[in-house]
Amino acid sequence: HTTVDTSGLLQHVKFQSSNFENILTWDGGPASTSDTVYSVEYKKYGERKWLAKAGCQRITQKFCNLTMETRNHTEFYYAKVTAVSAGGPPVTKMTDRFSSLQHTTIKPPDVTCIPKVRSIQMLVHPTLTPVLSEDGHQLTLEEIFHDLFYRLELHVNHTYQMHLEGKQREYEFLGLTPDTEFLGSITILTPILSKESAPYVCRVKTLPDRTWAYS
């Protein structure tokens, strides 16, 4: 659709967002050199005034953290980068319309896997995001995605798996063999926006059954 600019100073300006941490990234084109510097601006949908991002003016690195500037997850944003190289004209490129709610990817959950003799307990820890509620506290993923649930799998061996899923944070796989190694995986899913995290994986071994020794 687009004929690339002949200046070749700047390309692929885009947001990369994970758990609502929104990083603007870009590449230098074939004409960029070590003295090429980049300046970043951002704005909300429908606003015409671009705002300069402090700390991302005339920089040489090819990324800029815009999390705080784009932290309203119901808003649409744009960012643009202007590249300047010695003696040449500036080149500006802007992102596509960005919504962290739509575009953020979900990281694997933080989980503690606790082995017992005949069961394995899995405790999912809440994931805080930079998104603020109206009263100013940081929202968890669960508070942002009301449909969020966890899918848990326990691989007993190559042929047999156990499954649990739900919205709660504490789970227990029961009826396991003592002193046996299991592979657990826990994934976050948000069906409405079709998001799925990579799984958190834990390898745990149930505790040996010591009761027979005292019988």
Epitope: H1, T2, G46, T92, K93, M94, D96
Partner: antibody
Framework: EVQLQQSGPELVRPGTSVKISCKAS????????MNWVKQSPEESLEWIGE????????TYNQKFEAKATLTVDQSSNTAYLQLTSLTSEDSAVYYC?????????WGQGTTVTVSS | DIVMTQSPSSLAVSVGEKVTMSCKSS????????????LAWYQQKPGQSPKLLIY???SRESGVPDRFTGSGSGTDFTLTISSVKTEDLAVYYC?????????FGSGTKLEIK
């Protein structure tokens, strides 16, 4: 001063295609979205679609998806609207218009007349 | 698609009179993140391109005379010209940018008596 200069009027045969240009000056084409709007006596103003000249990403009005193709040439600061399989219903004035929501600058319009 | 309905389709007034024209949308245009309405007004004089007058329902574009005022919220919007001048002879269009596809009203033609 921001200006959008469109190509001249077109008289074309039914079934053929036409490509209209919109050259931006006074700003970098890649610093804002470009939209295209159709104006005909029957339908008033109709939004055809938008393009992000930096990425080439397009969003079309479903009504025009099979009819219109939006492109840009960054090196010449020019946006294009191509219309295919023309019929008399495509006879209209076509405008390019800048910005991502409402439209703050408009080209002067290109009249397309489809006639055998 | 959001349907924009303008009324009246035309009106004739004398110089110096106050004019109001209506634009109604088939669904609310209130953008929750900034509590503004995604509505713009344009003026198109004979033989010219449309010109932006008002955006966010009530923000006047730079250089537009202050006799032009936009108001309203949700689904009902109004453009008011407080004291019409001869150069205001034009067709006035509203446009929503709340959701794709962006849509326009069919216009109100202002004629001078």
């Amino acid at each position: 001063e921001v200006q959008l200069q469109q190509s001249g009027p077109e008289l074309v045969r039914p079934g053929t295609s036409v490509k209209i240009s919109c050259k931006a000056s006074g700003y970098s084409l890649t610093a804002d979205y470009m939209n295209w709007v159709k104006q005909s006596p029957e339908e008033s103003l109709e939004w055809i679609g938008e393009i992000n000249p930096s990425t080439g990403t397009t969003t079309y009005n479903q009504k025009f998806e099979a009819k219109a193709t939006l492109t840009v040439d960054q090196s010449s600061n020019t946006a294009y609207l191509q219309l295919t399989s023309l019929t008399s219903e495509d006879s209209a004035v076509y405008y390019c218009a800048r910005f991502d929501a409402y439209f703050d600058y408009w080209g002067q319009g290109t009249t397309v007349t489809v006639s055998s | 698609d959001i349907v924009m309905t303008q009324s009246p389709s035309s009106l004739a007034v004398s110089v110096g009179e106050k004019v109001t024209m209506s634009c109604k949308s088939s669904q609310s245009l209130l953008y929750s993140s900034n509590q503004k309405n995604c509505l713009a007004w344009y003026q198109q004089k004979p033989g010219q391109s449309p010109k932006l007058l008002i955006y966010w329902a009530s923000s006047r574009e730079s250089g537009v005379p202050d006799r032009f005022t936009g108001s309203g919220s949700g689904t009902d919007f109004t453009l008011t010209i407080s004291s019409v001048k001869t150069e205001d002879l034009a067709v006035y269009y509203c446009q929503q940018y709340f959701s794709y596809p962006f849509t326009f009203g069919s216009g109100t033609k202002l004629e001078i008596k």
